[in-house]
Amino acid sequence: LPAQVAFTPYAPEPGSTCRLREYYDQTAQMCCSKCSPGQHAKVFCTKTSDTVCDSCEDSTYTQLWNWVPECLSCGSRCSSDQVETQACTREQNRICTCRPGWYCALSKQEGCRLCAPLRKCRPGFGVARPGTETSDVVCKPCAPGTFSNTTSSTDICRPHQICNVVAIPGNASMDAVCTSTSPTRSMAPGAVHLPQPVSTRSQHTQPTPEPSTAPSTSFLLPMGPSPPAEGSTGD
């Protein structure tokens, strides 16, 4: 014979558990109905009456089937550096995420507790690792032959233009200046110029060539004495 369907509240069989969307009430010692998301238990069950549920009030919510006496308070309004990606409803909490140009420096279960502006790389430095929702930008010095003349959270180091004749050699924060009307060529468009190890560089064994005397320009200088390199042009 099929087992009879018990209606809440009911006393469970010894050693068995209550069914899905039910809970065991210790006081009544009965299996009782849970309240649906968006509701809470207004009156707990007894041996003869089931749980009485009521809708959550404004600015409160329950996300799961529950038997809590009060709904949870929605989080405070999103701060000026955040955007509300999920509104506070009776069934879900408000979720705040960082606005564009910011990242989450301190996260919480859902959304972000503390946003911080993405680091901007200063001239002479390029973005080596872009920012994400939860991590900051990492800046690295531009390698010889590349430069960045901006303060930006997105700009990478770009190659110096290559000149027939160099008027001013490029350095880490400035492009080369050519004497002719146009450079002979530049690095191929779309090439990635994130700062990276340069296998031909010898800085592990001897002093580094200065960014101001970057090979991409200085080797194309006309014959004769080369112009003095700028001193200490680290960036």
Epitope: K140, P195, S232
Partner: antibody
Framework: QVQLVQSGAEVKKPGASVKVSCKAS????????IHWVRQAPGQGLEWMGW????????DYADKFKKRVTMTADTSISTAFMELSRLRSDDTAVYYC????????????WGQGTLVTVSS | DIQMTQSPSSLSASVGDRVTITCQGS??????LAWFQQKPGKAPKLLIY???SLQTGVPSRFSGSRSGTDFTLTISSLQPEDFATYFC????????FGGGTKLELK
């Protein structure tokens, strides 16, 4: 919290070399470059150079190019500055400082290492 | 090299005084100028970066400003703990410290 801890004081003879260490903690070592700055007794601050621990790239002030070598060991989050052919006027406190490459510069410093060059 | 000329080299003042220290760059350095405070036997401490930005934890009596290639550090009302040596530092094109200003109690 962010800390840069430098090695202890050194006494060296002219012509010798010295290697100063700077151990970083409290942040991702490879995300910042390390500068070295020195200060002779009663004098101002003098920038010597930087190293990017991630790639080993360096840049040295012209004055020190022929005598300084900056290295880093990422496995122990430590930067090193070696100065060779020491002279008496190299007697100074040597500092390391970190730099994130943004407009915020040298926001954390080591406590300094006194190097005395004397015969 | 870009040279940074800092003045005065020394300065006597009293608690509560308003003090200004200036740094002049030999070339344009945009806003890439920082100010450091150093006390005897201690490492320098960053006060202001990018000309105007106050480093976290630094009291608001410290401020920075600029007019062309002239940069100024102002302490609006000197406190006993402010007596120290101050250095400007340019980091736009290479790196260069100013000569320093020793701020002493009058």
């Amino acid at each position: 919290q962010v800390q840069l801890v430098q090695s202890g004081a050194e006494v060296k003879k002219p012509g010798a070399s010295v290697k100063v260490s700077c151990k970083a903690s409290g942040y991702t070592f490879t995300d910042y470059i390390i500068h070295w700055v020195r200060q002779a007794p009663g004098q101002g601050l003098e920038w010597m150079g930087w190293i990017d621990p991630d790639y080993g790239n360096t840049d040295y002030a012209d004055k020190f190019k022929k005598r300084v070598t900056m290295t880093a060991d990422t496995s122990i989050s430590t930067a090193f500055m070696e100065l060779s052919r020491l002279r008496s006027d190299d007697t100074a406190v040597y500092y390391c400082a970190r730099d994130e490459g943004s407009p915020l510069v040298m926001d954390a410093w080591g406590q300094g290492t006194l190097v005395t060059v004397s015969s | 090299d870009i040279q940074m000329t800092q003045s005065p080299s020394s300065l006597s003042a009293s608690v509560g005084d308003r003090v200004t220290i200036t740094c002049q760059g030999s070339q344009n350095i945009d806003n890439y100028l920082a100010w450091f405070q150093q006390k005897p036997g201690k490492a320098p401490k960053l006060l202001i970066y990018s000309t105007y930005s106050l480093q976290t934890g630094v009291p608001s009596r410290f401020s920075g400003s600029r007019s062309g290639t002239d940069f100024t550090l102002t302490i609006s009302s000197l406190q006993p703990e402010d007596f120290a040596t101050y250095f400007c530092f340019q980091y736009n094109n290479g790196y260069m410290f100013g000569g320093g200003t020793k701020l002493e109690l009058k």
